[in-house]
């Protein structure tokens, strides 16, 4: 029997019941490898609690349609009295990736997933040359999904200050240029996940092999591998890679685009600081309504609710249902079973089953899908309870009044699929958004002006124009919400811009739309504000100005308008400078652009160095000057001792020449002991260093070795800019 | 709520040994780098050893072979086992936990009597 998904075939997959911390491995094609399951299981159930194995689908006994997939066992299990066989069941709806399986729920007898996926899809529009698993599960069973940051066409200029060439890349899988407009990507090869644009030439220089991987829980990383035997000229007899680290960002709020760390022999490390990295939570409610602080969601679907005796009607062929949701349908045949969702058969009306009741309920928010579970309806032949399974899809242009209607996708083994399209199923994600603009290769961060969270305070805008009794106090942050504290207590809570005065508060427009590079500044609108007549909304526009070394300066008035629907600031700062890289001389390194100076020469030691132990080796680094400690070199940068038998490999030699580019600090020997390979590669040295207010002197930390260069990450105070 | 507690400060004599715990709460623990500091009245507080999410290890120089941070994951715990006590450590000492997030514990007092 032919593999019903191939693309699918060449990985095992996980799944998980957050709920049971029950962990699911599902391998479609073949079998899992885990040994408690047997040899022939396709879907194995590791139960964490009970520390226990079972085998829930055995590839042997598949049976596949278009969008089903049911793997049974030999295994009796016992649900309302009745002998059956333990099953597991994948429902398949087409996706624009890889995507996931996703856990459903399981009774006695059957556990069912569902898996939105470009394998289920009739034309092949969305598919892939090259795509590899783009989640994990960390030890605690939560999930980390990458899905989101899949282009479908073009791909991520990564950000390394390197005029002369470009480094574009995409996540899990290749760069679709056909789909692209942007001329640069063109000339990029097939099945290329990183393609490096020099000139008018484009080359390959990695492509996806394995899925994406879970390093030290904090960290995902993604390698990509050039598949070509030949070699390129300019990497010096290198084979070409990719290493994509995606880090959950700290309460340090750094920026979300991909940026080169690394760059020598054609290695290429970039880390990309992400929400995507993040664990997602599966938030569940029995209620109609969700909300999660972690995500930032907030779902209510009351306003679905129909009363009076009315529900919607799906039309499923041979069968009508009858729906209503966060309510019974009032319908008459139906009422008498409390029935959510109620089947009725077109050609026997007196045919009614209750196809999910409204108490046994289970909304679902889970990486951007919106479930609605409805359990224990009629039980049918097999002796199973009908239930209902509502997935619901945002539109903001639904009709019936932005409520939509249920659609009926399909039947599986007495559970009913549904579809529903309705703009109460729409989620603003904060990770949608960045806080910055991009013009070609220049790009531009306004982070530094976010205010997150107390003791921090808005800015408040300069109004010159009103006299102290009428004065309005105009608040402001920038890509968040306003912070409730001193006079913007009483703002309302979503507003990004909020006007104060001695009648209340006013929300003047919200963070929906990234910053835009305008004529030479950058644009922030805002808008959604508070009503301001005739059906429209207040809108705010703030113009960033470039004002090099100014992180102090706050947001002027310069109009309102239109009858209170529109104000307009401006604001000269140094975070609308485009971001530039600096060298510096004696361990010092100045950035023009904001007006900070650097001086690391605290951290040089005179006489030693600062040791850091791994479990095989001791290095000696410092800071700006050679280590001084035996057996290192005397000109060494960084040193490398083999605790087994004192080996010594010199790391490179010290320099004092600091780099800077958008806030990472980062000092570079080179020159070290050759490796013992065909070009006999010189070792080299790292070390980034990053503000931490509190750290002081701080320490290093040895990070990883990637093929020739050692890297260090250093937190401390000396890197941190004087604050405004 | 994130909570970082120390414990097994005291008074001892030079030469002596101690053995420091701090036990965390509320966070992903193995996904921090932890770090002992130290303050001594009337001086800024400074770094004594530092254990990385990745294992790498960092002893400030003065305090090289006779201090030896150490981490539990399991127990979401860090240790630091003082020997060869002497006067000039003579601090309160914090822990701190830094990775997604930084939190700091309230300290324990150590006195090196000579």
């Known amino acids: 029997q032919a593999a019903p998904f191939p693309e699918l075939c060449s990985y095992t997959w996980e799944a998980v019941d957050t709920k049971n911390n029950v962990l699911y491995k599902i391998n479609i094609c073949g079998s899992v490898d885990i040994v408690q399951c047997g040899p022939s299981s396709a879907v194995c159930m590791h139960d964490l609690k009970t520390r226990t194995y079972h085998s829930v689908g055995d590839s042997v006994l598949r049976s596949a349609t278009r969008s089903l997939l049911e793997f049974n066992t030999t295994v009796s299990c016992d649900q309302q009295g009745t002998n059956h066989r333990v099953q597991s069941s994948i429902a398949f709806l087409c996706g624009k990736t890889l995507g996931t399986p996703e856990f459903v729920t399981a009774t006695e007898c059957v556990h069912y997933f569902e898996w939105r996926t470009t394998a289920a899809c009739k034309k092949d529009i969305f598919k892939a040359n090259k795509e590899v698993p783009c989640y994990v599960f960390d030890e605690e069973l939560r999930k980390h999904d990458l899905n989101p940051l899949i282009k479908l066409s073009g791909a991520y200029l990564v950000d390394d200050s390197d005029p002369d060439t470009s480094l574009f890349i995409n996540v899990c899988r290749d760069i679709d240029t056909l789909r692209d407009p942007g001329s640069q990507l063109r000339a990029c090869p097939p099945g290329t996940a990183a393609c490096l644009v020099r000139g008018h030439q484009a080359f390959d220089v990695g492509q996806p092999r394995d899925g994406l991987k879970l390093v030290r829980k904090d960290r995902l990383v993604l390698s990509y591998v050039r598949e070509e035997a030949g070699k390129l000229d300019f990497c010096d007899g290198h084979s070409p890679a990719v290493t994509i680290t995606f880090v959950c960002p700290s309460e340090r709020r750094e920026g979300t685009i991909p940026k080169l760390t690394a760059k020598s022999n054609c290695r290429y490390e970039i880390e990309w600081i992400t929400e995507y990295a993040c664990h997602r939570d599966y938030l569940e409610s029995k209620t109609c309504s969700l909300s999660g602080e972690q995500q930032d969601v907030s779902i209510d679907l009351t306003p679905l609710a129909q009363s009076g005796g009315s529900s919607y009607i799906s039309d499923g062929k041979e069968y009508l249902f009858y729906l209503n949701v966060c309510g019974e349908t009032e319908i008459q045949f139906c009422n008498k079973k409390q029935a959510a969702v109620c089947q009725v058969k077109k050609s026997d009306t007196s045919q009614v089953k209750a196809a999910g009741r409204y108490h046994n309920q289970t909304l679902r928010y889970s990486d951007g899908d919106l479930t609605l579970i409805y359990f224990g309806g009629d039980e049918c032949s097999s002796g199973f309870q009908r239930m209902s399974v509502i997935n619901f899809e945002c539109n903001k242009t639904a009709g019936n009044d932005g409520k939509g209607t249920p659609v009926f996708t399909g039947e599986v083994d007495c559970t009913y699929f549904f579809t529903w399209d309705t703009e109460y199923a729409c989620v603003k994600e904060k990770e949608d958004l960045l806080c910055g603009a991009t013009d070609g290769k220049k790009r531009y961060d306004l982070s530094a002006l976010v205010r997150h969270a107390e003791p921090e305070q808005n800015w408040e805008a300069v109004d010159g124009s009103q006299t102290e009794t009428e004065k309005k106090h105009f608040f402001i942050n920038i890509c968040h919400r306003v912070l409730q504290e001193g006079k913007a207590r009483g703002c309302p809570e979503d507003a990004a811009v909020c006007a104060v005065d001695k009648n209340g508060s006013k929300n003047l427009g919200k963070f929906i739309s990234s910053p835009m590079k305008e004529k030479g500044n950058i644009q922030l609108s805002y808008s959604d504000g508070d009503d301001c007549g005739h059906g429209k909304k207040i809108k705010t526009n703030i113009t960033l100005v470039c004002k090099p070394g100014d992180l102090e300066s706050a947001p002027v008035l310069r109009t309102s308008g239109e009858g209170g629907c529109f104000y307009e600031f401006e604001w000269h700062t140094a975070a609308a400078c485009v971001l530039s890289k600096t060298e510096g001389e004696n361990c010092t390194v100045f950035d023009s652009q904001a007006g900070f100076s650097f001086d690391l020469s605290p951290l040089t030691k005179k006489n030693g160095a600062y040791k850091v132990e791994t479990k095989k080796y001791d290095f000696y680094i410092n800071v700006c000057g050679p280590v001084s400690v035996s057996p290192c070199q005397p000109d060494s940068g960084a040193c490398q001792v083999a605790k087994s038998d004192e080996k010594t490999w010199n790391l490179g030699l010290s320099n004092a020449k600091l780099s800077y580019y958008d806030g990472m600090i980062q000092l570079n020997y080179r020159g070290g002991t050759p490796y013992n390979n065909e070009r006999h590669t010189p070792r080299a040295t790292l070390i980034t260093f990053l503000c931490d207010r509190d750290a002081g002197v701080g320490f290093p930390e040895y990070q990883e070795e990637d093929n020739s260069t050692y890297n260090f990450r250093w937190y401390t105070s000396y890197a941190c800019p004087e604050e405004p | 709520e994130v909570q970082l507690v120390e414990s097994g400060g005291g008074l001892v004599q030079a030469g002596g040994s101690l053995r420091l715990s701090c036990a965390a709460s509320g966070l992903t623990f193995s996904s921090y780098t932890m770090a002992w500091y130290r303050q001594a009245p009337g001086k800024e507080r400074e770094v004594v050893a530092a254990?990385?999410?990745?294992?790498?290890?960092y002893h400030e120089g003065s305090v090289q072979g006779r201090f030896i941070i150490s981490r539990d994951n399991a127990k979401n715990t860090v240790y630091l086992q003082m020997n060869s006590l002497k006067a000039e450590d003579t601090a309160v000492y914090y822990c701190r936990a830094n990775g997604p997030g930084t939190y700091w514990g309230q300290g324990t007092q150590v006195t090196v009597s000579s």
């Open positions: 254990i990385s999410s990745g294992d790498s290890i």
